[in-house]
Interface confidence: medium
């Protein structure tokens, strides 16, 4: 159910292009495919490259997107479109000047001189936002998921975009200036991830960041199954990266117990992140004993 | 930074008791407090703990009898109920370590505890 | 809840010598592992915290390693003052978290 065809405004498209990207990567880090027949994979590919050329029709001059080309472009929706296409970028042909140019316009564009990414678009489908819907601590959450796109794209834009380092680490000094005054566990998952990736999630902001974990196991919002389920896949590529890995089992299992595999309304960001951070375990954690996935994926019929 | 237990006497099975732990130099506004008893004679035992914003978290024995709440940026309650002769105690509150959570941090300082005796 | 077993019960060491106390957790705690030093009729002093950080003012010939389930405290160099029970106190989680049964150290 999570390999669909994208369609839509340039909103829609993303919605519909995510899970197919994530689900071909999850297959792919955890070999997979033979449970579905190879062939499906070159069929997935084929929807996620048509994903890519529809999207295009929504690049703006500036290189950002927006949901209408007559709408005012989005940061958020742009570092998302930059956060998928870094990862379809192993699976198809991206165009580089594509994806860098949409990180550039983020940077030149939409960063102010404290670190903090602005929005001055926001996105008409508020239901593909995941816990950044909460409007609670949005400059944090904002600039976090900005921060995590751009060092996602860092690899195949540093060359072309010389700034990117900079607005990175002006992001990061944000994130950490403002991280022991968050309450919000979304927020202190996904800004402690941002951290983990620049290797700063380091005291204080460690402590915070474990501490905001209810019964060890989850970033939890009281009702947000979804917003939870997005928060600890952040928080768990969190502790992976800090080669935590006494900290992650009670987590996946949490993730696990949870018996979400994506798809329906509202589910763009838990499901990518889901599945990120699942594939990321299993790469990391080879022998993984606590996790025990039943996984069905189908195609759309033709 | 100096804590200090207080309420702790002799009652009688059944009988509620409240007792205090106060704080000085620190506040528990920004800061964690635990709560720790010891039998005569006997080890520790973890009873639960509150946290800068006032959610209590307990050990899952002490659930349900046990209440620990915030009455003052100064001051931590522990309310006990249905007393037995097993909780005769010397009971000791201490400072999460850090602010954090004290069972990652660590308790530190410590109160000089207060005897809870429980005999019919 | 977690089971904490920490063993022995009792050791003796001369001044000088080392102490090496062990604490086992019945499930994976990470490193969420305290280890306190109990005077008779004083309340417990924090040495360890997190499995391995050494608390502020306490020696370095205390040292504390281990993580998930295997946990251990060594005193090198034992010291007269260092005659206590040590305690360890491990948390699965929030409401999961219990002391061990104490070590007593005995320095002759």
């Known amino acids: 159910h999570l390999i669909v065809t994208p369609a839509g405004c340039g909103e829609q498209n993303m919605i519909g292009m995510t899970p197919t990207v994530i689900a071909v990567h999850y297959l792919d880090q955890t070999e997979q495919w033979e449970k579905f027949g190879i062939e499906k994979r070159q069929e997935a590919l084929e929807l996620i490259k048509k994903g890519y050329t529809q999207q295009l029709a929504f690049k703006q001059p500036s290189s950002a997107y927006a949901a209408f080309n007559n709408r005012p472009p989005s940061t958020w929706l742009t570092a998302y479109v930059v956060k998928v296409f870094s990862l379809a970028a192993n699976l198809i042909a991206i165009d580089s000047h594509v994806l860098c140019g949409a990180v550039k316009w983020l940077i030149l564009e939409k960063q102010k001189p404290d670190g903090v990414f602005q929005e001055d678009g926001p996105v008409i489908h508020q239901e593909m936002i995941g816990g950044f819907r909460n409007a609670k601590e949005a400059d944090v959450s904002l600039t976090a998921f900005v921060l995590i796109a751009l060092q996602e794209a860092r690899d195949i834009c540093e060359g072309q975009v010389n700034s990117l380092p900079g607005s990175i680490n002006k992001a990061g000094e944000y994130i950490e200036a403002s991280y022991m005054n968050l309450q919000r566990p979304y927020t202190v998952a996904i800004a402690g991830y941002a951290l983990a990736l620049m290797n700063k999630l380091e005291e204080p902001y460690l402590g915070k960041f474990l501490n905001t974990a209810k019964d060890r196991n989850r970033w939890e919002e009281p009702d947000q199954q979804l917003y939870n389920v997005e928060a600890t896949s952040y928080a768990l590529l969190a502790l992976l990266l800090l080669k935590d890995f006494d900290s992650v089992p009670p987590v996946v299992r949490w993730l696990n117990e949870q018996r979400y595999y994506g798809g329906g309304y509202g589910s763009t960001q838990a499901t990518f992140m889901v599945f990120q951070a699942l594939a990321q375990y299993q790469t990391d954690v080879p022998d993984h004993k606590d996790l025990n996935m039943d996984v069905s994926f189908h195609l759309p019929s033709r | 930074q100096s804590l200090e237990e207080s309420g702790g006497r002799l009652v009688t099975p059944g009988t509620p008791l409240t007792l205090t732990c106060t704080v000085s130099g620190f506040s528990l506004s920004t800061y964690t407090l635990g709560w720790v008893r010891q039998a005569p004679g006997k080890g520790l035992e973890y009873i639960g703990w509150i946290d800068s914003s006032g959610s209590a978290y307990y050990a899952s024995w002490a659930k349900g009898r046990f209440t620990i709440s915030k009455a003052s940026s100064t001051t931590v309650d522990l309310k006990m109920a249905g007393l037995t002769t097993e909780d005769t105690a010397t009971y000791f509150c201490?400072?999460?370590?850090?602010?954090?959570?004290?069972?990652?941090?660590?308790?530190?300082?410590w109160g000089p505890g207060t005897l809870v005796t429980v005999s019919s | 809840d977690p089971v904490l077993t920490q063993t022995p019960s009792s050791t003796s060491a001369a001044v000088g010598g080392t102490v090496t106390i062990k604490c086992q957790a019945s499930q994976n705690i990470g490193r969420w592992l305290a280890w306190y030093q109990q005077k008779p009729g004083q309340p417990p002093k924090l040495l360890i915290y997190?499995?391995?950080d050494l608390a502020s003012g306490v020696p370095s010939r205390f040292k504390g390693s281990g993580s998930g389930t295997q946990f251990t405290l060594t005193i090198s160099g034992v010291q007269r003052e260092d005659a206590a029970t040590y305690y360890c106190l491990g948390s699965y989680s929030s409401s999961d978290s219990a002391f061990g049964g104490g070590t007593e150290v005995v320095v002759k």
């Open positions: 201490a400072s999460g370590n850090t602010g954090g959570d004290p069972l990652y941090y660590g308790m530190d300082p």
């Open positions: 997190r499995a391995s």
